[in-house]
């Protein structure tokens, strides 16, 4: 992939749109299809000022940890869906799209050089543990996915791309 493909806002917007579509087809987070067990996901809330004041290396750690946990969560949801009797086809489709999307985004971030930020010297303070929450419906899972892309991931890539432009 071209090194700065993720710096084209349309790329990220496509994945955000896919995640929002998935959230919408699950018929609302109160009454939509439930997960047979709770799944742990990253907390996507952003105190905008606090995020912008973080070192880009700290942002990178939080984004990578979040992406990793989100990928695990969606794979777990896929497994739960496979074990259910007559899983809805549309839900299966959106789960598959989310898995594919997260794999692509991970590759694009790697190409951008974001993983370099994770190589911190041994004497640096370890990062704060990632804040997490649990979800009990597919709708909530897709909402977390969309919010993670719209929030932390978009803010982080925006900063890295901005620096690269200087």
């Amino acid at each position: 992939a071209p090194p700065r493909l993720i710096c084209d806002s349309r790329v990220l917007e496509r994945y955000i749109l896919e995640a929002k579509e998935a959230e919408n087809v699950t018929m609302g987070c109160a009454e939509g299809p439930r997960l047979s067990e709770n799944i742990t996901v990253p907390d996507t809330k952003v105190n905008f000022y606090a995020w912008k004041r973080m070192e880009v290396e700290e942002q990178a750690i939080e984004v990578w940890q979040g992406l990793s946990l989100l990928s695990e969560a969606i794979l777990q949801a896929q497994a739960l869906l496979a074990n259910s009797s007559q899983p809805p086809e549309t839900l299966q489709l959106h789960i598959d799209k989310a898995i594919s999307g997260l794999r692509s985004l991970t590759s694009l971030l790697r190409v951008l050089g974001a993983q370099k930020e994770l190589m911190s010297p041994p004497d640096t303070t370890p990062p704060a543990p990632l804040r997490t929450l649990t979800v009990d419906t597919f709708c909530k899972l897709f909402r977390v996915y969309a919010n993670f892309l719209r929030g932390k991931l978009k803010l982080y890539t925006g900063e890295v791309c901005r620096r690269g432009d200087r």
Partner: antibody
Framework: EVQLVQSGAEVKKPGESLKISCKGS????????IGWVRQMPGKGLEWMGW????????RYSPSFQGQVTISADKSISTAYLQWSSLKASDTAMYYC??????????WGQGTLVTVSS | SYVLTQPPSVSVAPGKTARITCSGD??????AYWYQQKPGQAPVLVIY???KRPSGIPERFSGSNSGNTATLTISRVEAGDEADYYC??????????FGGGTKLTVLG
């Protein structure tokens, strides 16, 4: 003690320009942002925009984009809000506030701007 | 643009609990903030990041946020709590949005 001191009240005519100020003290001015908030008579708070004096990054509320200009001079720890052509509807109290992880945690005393012909 | 809706007024008797709500589309996905403004004074931050209290704010003030609604709760209400209260939130894009405000009246 964190303090934000704003310039005094202004009475202007429609079409005139104006620049009001907000001077920070008691903290590192470039380590925090400054936000501007409008409160029209008897009405609620409206966020106008914020500035990061360290990086000179500015974000305007869509409602105020193109209507006002936010700037800062970090050498004198002062933020500014300016209008190139005032309207009667700009009559309001304008507050500056420090933006931190606890947003708008310290406020100026407010500058009352009256625009009348 | 993002809109936060608050009831125009809430009344409560001294010593009772006041609850002021703030609603917005999926507000629970964002942090909520609350400000108190007394007549002729600048606002004061009373709750940040949904439920944290800045230093100097009494424990009587608490906050919660989930779904589409954030709530500011003031327990054991005192006459001095009479004021306008505003909710606010950061959007993912960096805009700061205020609600329309709620006038809290302490009866008696």
């Amino acid at each position: 003690e964190v303090q934000l001191v704003q310039s005094g009240a202004e009475v202007k005519k429609p079409g005139e320009s104006l620049k009001i100020s907000c001077k920070g003290s008691g903290y590192s001015f470039t380590s925090y942002w400054i936000g501007w908030v409008r409160q029209m008579p008897g009405k609620g708070l409206e966020w106008m925009g914020w500035i990061d004096p360290y990086r000179s990054e500015i974000r305007y509320s869509p409602s105020f984009q193109g209507q006002v200009t936010i700037s800062a001079d970090k050498s004198i720890s002062t933020a500014y809000l300016q209008w190139s052509s005032l309207k009667a509807s700009d009559t309001a109290m304008y507050y500056c506030a420090r933006v931190s992880s606890e947003p708008f945690d310290s406020w100026g005393q407010g500058t009352l701007v009256t625009v009348s012909s | 643009s993002y809109v936060l809706t608050q009831p125009p007024s809430v009344s409560v008797a001294p010593g009772k609990t006041a609850r002021i709500t703030c609603s917005g589309d999926k507000l629970g996905d964002h942090y909520a903030y609350w400000y108190q403004q007394k007549p002729g004074q600048a606002p004061v931050l009373v709750i940040y990041d949904d439920s944290k209290r800045p230093s100097g704010i009494p424990e009587r003030f608490s906050g919660s946020n989930s779904g589409n609604t954030a709530t500011l709760t003031i327990s054991r209400v005192e006459a001095g709590d009479e004021a306008d209260y505003y909710c606010a939130t950061w959007t993912f894009e960096g805009d700061y949005v205020f609600g329309g405000g709620t006038k809290l009246t302490v009866l008696g």
